[in-house]
């Protein structure tokens, strides 16, 4: 009885399109695949950023597949063919693994690339990105900053950048169509006539660096005696309702300070016939349905009662 | 909510200066552009200039040939533009107006400054 | 500096009917992808108001009757269907290039 053997993939490479860490793997079927005519061949492809402890894992019949990378670090990948035991008569045939690298020549030291890098999608709408110079770096340094996320034809650079001392230190983006729920890609690279400087590769989702408006329209309403409930309403904008988490502090008396987290617009406060000032203060937060991570939008206006009706029905500002 | 609230209506005469302020609130001042805009009585928009609050970077319509002076006041949240050598035809209503970026135009406009130039 | 031009001067439109402005540029205003053209209406005695920006995307609040089009140099507001309220002067502007500079007006009245 032969033994069965099948070669690994021909030609397998790792192809940069220029999406900034958006990358291709691709190959080729491997060599005499004849004996095979009849055979659905698989390939298993491993692949990682170098220094990753763990490969992702991917079974695939194509010749192609593609993912994001950190591109300030390298990439390795390796595959190799599988022969389903339909084709074989018994258990899966492997090939030897064909492997490949990919990373880009570091220009300049890391010292001179762009420090605290910091984004904020403010109120789901405008997308604001700013970024210290590089430690030691001449004034002659400046930075450009270029952007991909699936749906661009190819990477573009920043619209309007914002300065200090005529370099670039930030970016003010364009509409962004489509960007969200989707990995985004950014590469903030310099130029200077005394050193190269080194690029920077970020990745993030827009979804998940969202900074709400603060939430508006604070009023009281008198529920019973020994009620109050506090009502506000949603910031203006595009974020839905049932994105948002508040975040409520209350200050009874200018002594008792209550803080509490809700997902509606209301909260409902116990108070005595006592009380005879009352203020709150709300600030909001995507949630956990519509985004991994969030940023608390800055407090509402604080809204105060103070005085003998706080038994009356409506208390307005 | 966004508002931009202006200084009042002034006369002046020809020859000196006028000082326009404009009052931002309900967003973070130095995350948008200031632009300042002006309206002669029945004419169409003239664009004066803008400010960067973030940074202080400022550009200007040279058609005022340095008679325009755009500041801003991170810690107030207040944007100025001063219009000097004043002449009757600088007579018009001043508008401040906020916008994120050249790619959005210009979302919020103050209620407008009426700058009257008169002998 | 970039001149814009906007057609007509004014313009007469029945209720319920579509109304159209014309605004060419003196040099395309188009760069990174984006058509940096706006339109702006506005009212006796109020400030401009943000109808649309870069070329076809609406501003905040506004109406769905109202839409932009165009790249390049040319570009068009639309109004599909004639409100009273719509009762102003229409601006197109361009914010490419420093000055940002706008059209002349188009006065839009009922017929």
């Known amino acids: 009885d032969t033994e069965i053997k099948v070669n690994p993939p021909q030609d397998f490479e790792i192809v940069d399109p220029g999406y900034l860490g958006y990358l291709y793997l691709q190959w080729q079927p491997p060599l005499s695949l004849d004996h095979f005519k009849e055979c659905t061949v698989e390939y298993e492809l491993k692949y990682r950023n170098i220094g990753s402890e763990t490969w992702k894992t991917i079974i695939t019949k194509n010749l192609h597949y593609k993912d994001g990378f950190d591109l300030n670090k390298g990439i390795e990948a390796k595959i190799h063919t599988l022969l389903p035991w339909q084709c074989t008569n018994g258990s899966e045939v492997q090939s030897s693994w064909a492997e490949t690298t990919y990373w880009i020549s570091p220009q300049g030291i890391p010292e001179t690339k762009v420090q605290d890098m910091d984004c904020v999608y403010y109120n789901w709408q405008y997308l604001l990105c700013s970024w210290k110079p590089g430690i030691g770096v001449l004034l002659d340094t400046n930075y450009n900053l270029f952007y991909w996320y699936e749906g661009l034809d190819h990477a573009l650079q920043c619209v309007d950048y914002i300065k200090a001392d005529g370099q670039n230190i930030g970016c003010r983006f364009p509409y962004l169509e489509a960007s969200d729920y989707k990995d985004f890609y950014i590469c903030v690279n310099g130029s200077s006539e005394n050193k190269p400087i080194r690029s920077s590769y970020f990745t993030f989702q827009l979804q998940n660096i969202v900074k709400p408006l603060p939430p508006v329209y604070l009023t009281f309403t008198r529920e019973s005696s020994c009620e109050i409930k506090l009502k506000w309403s949603i910031p203006l904008g595009p974020i839905p309702a049932r994105c948002f988490d508040y975040e409520i502090e209350i200050r009874e008396d200018d002594t008792t300070l209550v803080t509490a987290t809700v997902e509606n617009e209301t909260y409902t406060l116990k108070t005595t016939n006592e009380t005879r000032q009352l203020c709150f203060v709300v600030r909001s937060k995507v949630n956990i349905y519509c985004s991994d991570d969030g940023i608390w939008s800055e407090w509402s206006d604080k809204q105060c009662w103070e005085g003998e009706d706080l038994s009356k029905k409506t208390l307005l500002r | 909510q966004v508002q931009l609230v202006q200084s009042g209506a002034e006369v002046k005469k020809p020859g000196s200066s006028v000082k326009v302020s404009c009052k931002a609130s309900g967003y973070t001042f130095s995350n948008y552009l200031m632009n300042w805009v002006r309206q002669a009585p029945g004419q169409g928009l003239e664009w004066m200039g803008r400010?960067?609050?973030?940074?202080?970077?400022?550009d200007y319509n040279q058609n005022f040939k340095d008679r325009v002076t755009i500041t801003a006041d991170k810690s107030t949240s207040t944007a100025y533009m001063e219009l000097s050598s004043l002449r009757s035809e600088d007579t018009a209503v001043y508008y401040c107006?906020?916008?994120?970026?050249?790619?959005?135009?210009?979302?919020?406009w103050g209620q407008g400054t009426l700058v009257t130039v008169s002998s | 500096d970039i001149v814009m031009t906007q057609s007509p001067d004014s313009l007469a439109v029945s209720l319920g009917e579509r109304a159209t402005i014309n605004c060419r540029a003196s040099?395309?205003?188009?760069?990174?992808?984006?058509?940096?053209a706006n339109w702006y209406q506005q009212k006796p005695g109020q400030p401009p108001k943000l109808l649309i920006y870069?070329?076809?995307r609406q501003g905040s609040g506004v109406p769905d009757r109202f839409s932009g089009s165009g790249s390049g140099t040319d570009f068009t507001l639309t109004i599909s269907s004639l409100q009273a309220e719509d009762v102003a002067v229409y601006y197109c502007q361009q914010s490419k290039e420093v000055p940002w500079t706008f059209g002349g007006g188009t006065k839009l009245e009922i017929k």
């Open positions: 400010i960067d609050p973030y940074d202080g970077d400022i």
């Open positions: 040099e395309s205003v188009d760069n990174y992808g984006i058509s940096f």
């Open positions: 870069a070329a076809s």
């Open positions: 107006a906020r916008g994120y970026g050249t790619a959005y135009g210009v979302d919020y």
